[in-house]
């Protein structure tokens, strides 16, 4: 089996967040970091609002999930972090006139980090 090669994160918003390499496609299907970056820019009003201190890390863990050479799957957010962010930020998103994105449906992510389903708890 070909070993998993990780790529440096080139998205400025997602640098210095505790890990620095990723592997595309991401958890919402983007093949290119440039496409992930453009989608991420649409969250800037929500990040600047400050609805959750974990929002930026959560979004980066979805759009540029953590990569390690040891494991052949991307490591994204845990469901608990997603639910925490959603609880704080969904009401703000509604104020902006938008719904919580289906692509960030918290049921998509492992409930907690374990050997079977690795994820980042934030």
């Amino acid at each position: 089996e070909e070993e998993r090669r990780c790529d440096p994160i080139r998205i400025s918003m997602c640098q210095n967040l505790g890990y620095n390499v990723t592997k595309m496609p991401n958890l919402v299907g983007h093949e290119l970091q440039t496409d992930a970056e453009l989608q991420l820019t649409t969250f800037t009003p929500l990040i600047q609002y400050g609805c959750s201190s974990q929002l930026q890390f959560f979004l980066c863990s979805v759009y540029v999930p953590m990569c390690t050479e040891k494991i052949n799957i991307p490591i994204g957010p845990c469901g608990g972090m997603c639910l925490s962010v959603k609880r704080r930020c969904e009401p703000v998103l509604k104020e902006f006139g938008f719904a919580w994105p289906e692509s960030l449906n918290c049921s998509k992510f492992p409930p907690q980090n374990d050997h079977n389903h690795m994820c980042m708890e934030g």
């Epitope: 400025s12 299907g29 440039t34 453009l38 820019t41 649409t42 998103l93 994105p101 289906e102």
Partner: antibody, heavy 120, light 107 residues
Framework: EVQLVESGGGLVKPGGSLRLSCAAS????????MSWVRQAPGKGLEWVSA????????YYAESVKGRFTISRDDSKNTLYLQMNSLKTEDTAVYYC?????????????WGQGTLVTVSS | DIQMTQSPSSLSASVGDRVTITCRAS??????LNWYQQKPGKAPKLLIY???SLQSGVPSRFSGSGSGTDFTLTISSLQPEDFATYYC?????????FGGGTKVEIK
């Protein structure tokens, strides 16, 4: 109330240059990515370029890459499109639009458009 | 580049009719599909985002559906102010691309 007002359009000869401006008001300009979309007379919509809220990332359609430059001046709440080496096929109404969507890129507010005519 | 193909390019309908416009992507775009309405001499107006979410302030007679490559915009009961041109737009990858438009005319 969100308002986007374009200016700078006009008649220019092929090979010439033009700079479009878009004055934004009614929202926190630095929070939003912005974009230019054009529409040739009697034709459909064509995305031209986009820029992130920070101005650090820019995106272009292949048809304008290397000729057009998008930029923003946050102190003036203004978006720009510098158009060089203009071609007749660049003739269009140019709209400035706010890009948002929280996970999908949508243009939720548009300016009234400014007409660029490239002709000899 | 992802090509977006709309059909029909034009249609004639009467007030009260149910109107359906389709948009097909040249590759899967998940739910990254938005719909706009444009009237002559005016800027486009956002109707639907993320395939099926109604933009704030848009009448509920407009609805969107679909995922992957095939999408639909439906106007449940056409009103006089709905006669316009409708465009789909994908935001899955750059370059962002629009469909060719569907002109809805009065029968």
């Amino acid at each position: 109330e969100v308002q986007l007002v374009e200016s700078g359009g006009g008649l220019v000869k092929p090979g010439g240059s033009l700079r479009l401006s878009c004055a934004a008001s009614g929202f926190t300009f630095t929070s939003y990515a912005m974009s230019w979309v054009r529409q040739a007379p009697g034709k459909g919509l064509e995305w031209v370029s986009a820029i992130s809220g920070s101005g650090g990332s820019t995106y272009y359609a292949e048809s304008v890459k290397g000729r057009f430059t998008i930029s923003r001046d946050d102190s003036k709440n203004t978006l720009y499109l510098q158009m060089n080496s203009l071609k007749t096929e660049d003739t269009a109404v140019y709209y400035c639009a706010r890009a948002t969507g929280f996970g999908t890129v949508v243009f939720d507010y548009w300016g009234q458009g400014t007409l660029v005519t490239v002709s000899s | 580049d992802i090509q977006m193909t709309q059909s029909p390019s034009s249609l004639s309908a009467s007030v009260g009719d149910r109107v359906t416009i389709t948009c097909r992507a040249s590759q899967s775009i998940s739910s990254y599909l938005n719909w706009y309405q444009q009237k002559p001499g005016k800027a486009p107006k956002l109707l639907i985002y993320a395939a099926s979410s109604l933009q704030s302030g848009v009448p509920s007679r407009f609805s969107g559906s679909g995922s992957g490559t095939d999408f639909t915009l439906t106007i449940s009961s056409l009103q006089p102010e709905d006669f316009a041109t409708y465009y789909c737009q994908q935001s899955y990858s750059t370059p962002l691309t629009f469909g060719g438009g569907t002109k809805v005319e009065i029968k």
